[in-house]
Interface confidence: medium
Amino acid sequence: ARILRAPESHNVTFGSFVTLHCTATGIPVPTITWIENGNAVSSGSIQESVKDRVIDSRLQLFITKPGLYTCIATNKHGEKFSTAKAAATISIAEWSKPQKDNKGYCAQYRGEVCNAVLAKDALVFLNTSYADPEEAQELLVHTAWNELKVVSPVCRPAAEALLCNHIFQECSPGVVPTPIPICREYCLAVKELFCAKEWLVMEEKTHRGLYRSEMHLLSVPECSKLPSMHWDPTACARL
């Protein structure tokens, strides 16, 4: 088996769609498999076409984390296997940009992770700096939610409420749809009262560089930068 076209590396923003191409040839026509960080690809769609002993495989991915993607072309002559490999890296640029961008729209929350936390028919802000805002924001919550499984029973419900209301911010509709941040007082209550130990551990890990990316920072608000409920009763959301 021989690879004619290797997949290309990409540097993309969180929530982007990327298609990796791998083309191979051989007699007989090889099969192509994709590996993600050493394991079989768990998500994404694969499309294949074969023409004139050439196989073309396209892997479409929704990017939520960096990764090494390997295309493996294999065919068999009698008892002998022939294998060719080619790899591409997907890295993520500007993790925190979407949070600074106020471009988006209001829509009812249709996800699952925050169903029990957000009000029924809650109007949330969906950020159009993501390719697919609903999917990207739901994945952000899902990723951070998994980390909450290890926190204390006192901290967990408060952290879940903070997380969901921070990533799926309440939305003020109108001419310029605007996300309504959590009130500073509620954020501080979670940080200093309900989750004081956990928050310290997380900040310590951040300073020591134990987090490989800034992704978790998207799901943890900086309390000091949030508006106070005493400034404008409608400018921030109460948990």
Epitope: G174, V175, D232
Partner: antibody, heavy 123, light 108 residues
Framework: QVQLQESGPGLVKPSQTLSLTCTVS??????????WSWIRQHPGKGLEWIGY???????YYNPSLKSRVTISEDTSKNQFSLKLSSVTAADTAVYYC???????????????WGQGTMVTVSS | EIVLTQSPGTLSLSPGERATLSCRAS???????LAWYQQKPGQAPRLLIY???SRATGIPDRFSGSGSGTDFTLTISRLEPEDFAAYHC?????????FGGGTKVEIK
């Protein structure tokens, strides 16, 4: 107490540009949070939102008028202005300037209005 | 755009009576972002209600707003002589901001 006063010609010829100014007294147009709007009312009819300018200088217009409308501000004179180009008889109306409320839920409702100025488009 | 239809066009009532004005939207108004204004002849509109049910500063409590989705109501519990005027609804839920055609409340 904030007050708004419209000024400008009461008669404009068809195809010309209608120009109106709103002078704000009792408060600064550049003070945070407010948006400054133009709304019109055709004789005996309902109200129509034309557009507004935010304290930050960003402008937002009604899509039906967007190609003909410009709203600008002169902070030194504490005024904001409306220009409506290529006018026709259908633009004959009372033109109001108004202030959008400061709070987030109030920015697209109008809590203070000028008394209005009648503009007739006729040759 | 959201089209607002007000009914009735004219309401003839006597002072002391209850007035019920309707405003129907062509599509759902998010978060009940609907406002009501009062307008007297030769004057500019005056904000009464925003967010469907919140009274603006200085508005007497005989004025109340209710409703959600596509159907909204302005109620004046006991009409005072100064309440005879035109009333406009406005949605502040999506762009462009739109107003209803108005309801005139006149003395019977």
């Amino acid at each position: 107490q904030v007050q708004l006063q419209e000024s400008g010609p009461g008669l404009v010829k068809p195809s010309q540009t209608l120009s109106l100014t709103c002078t704000v007294s009792g408060g600064s147009i550049s003070s945070g949070g407010y948006c400054w709007s133009w709304i019109r009312q055709h004789p005996g009819k309902g109200l129509e939102w034309i557009g507004y300018i935010y304290y930050s200088g960003s402008t937002y217009y009604n899509p039906s008028l967007k190609s003909r409308v410009t709203i600008s501000e002169d902070t030194s004179k504490n005024q904001f202005s409306l220009k409506l180009s290529s006018v026709t008889a259908a633009d004959t109306a009372v033109y109001y300037c108004a202030r959008g409320g400061r709070w987030l839920q109030l920015r697209d409702v109008f809590d203070i209005w000028g008394q209005g100025t009648m503009v007739t488009v006729s040759s | 755009e959201i089209v607002l239809t007000q009914s009735p066009g004219t309401l003839s009532l006597s002072p002391g009576e209850r007035a019920t004005l309707s405003c129907r939207a062509s599509q759902s108004v998010s978060s009940s972002y609907l406002a009501w204004y009062q307008q007297k002849p030769g004057q500019a509109p005056r904000l009464l209600i925003y967010g469907a049910s919140s009274r603006a500063t200085g508005i007497p409590d005989r004025f109340s707003g209710s409703g959600s989705g596509t159907d909204f109501t302005l109620t004046i519990s006991r009409l005072e002589p100064e309440d005879f005027a035109a009333y406009h609804c406005q949605q502040h839920s999506s762009s462009p901001l739109t107003f209803g055609g108005g309801t005139k409340v006149e003395i019977k």
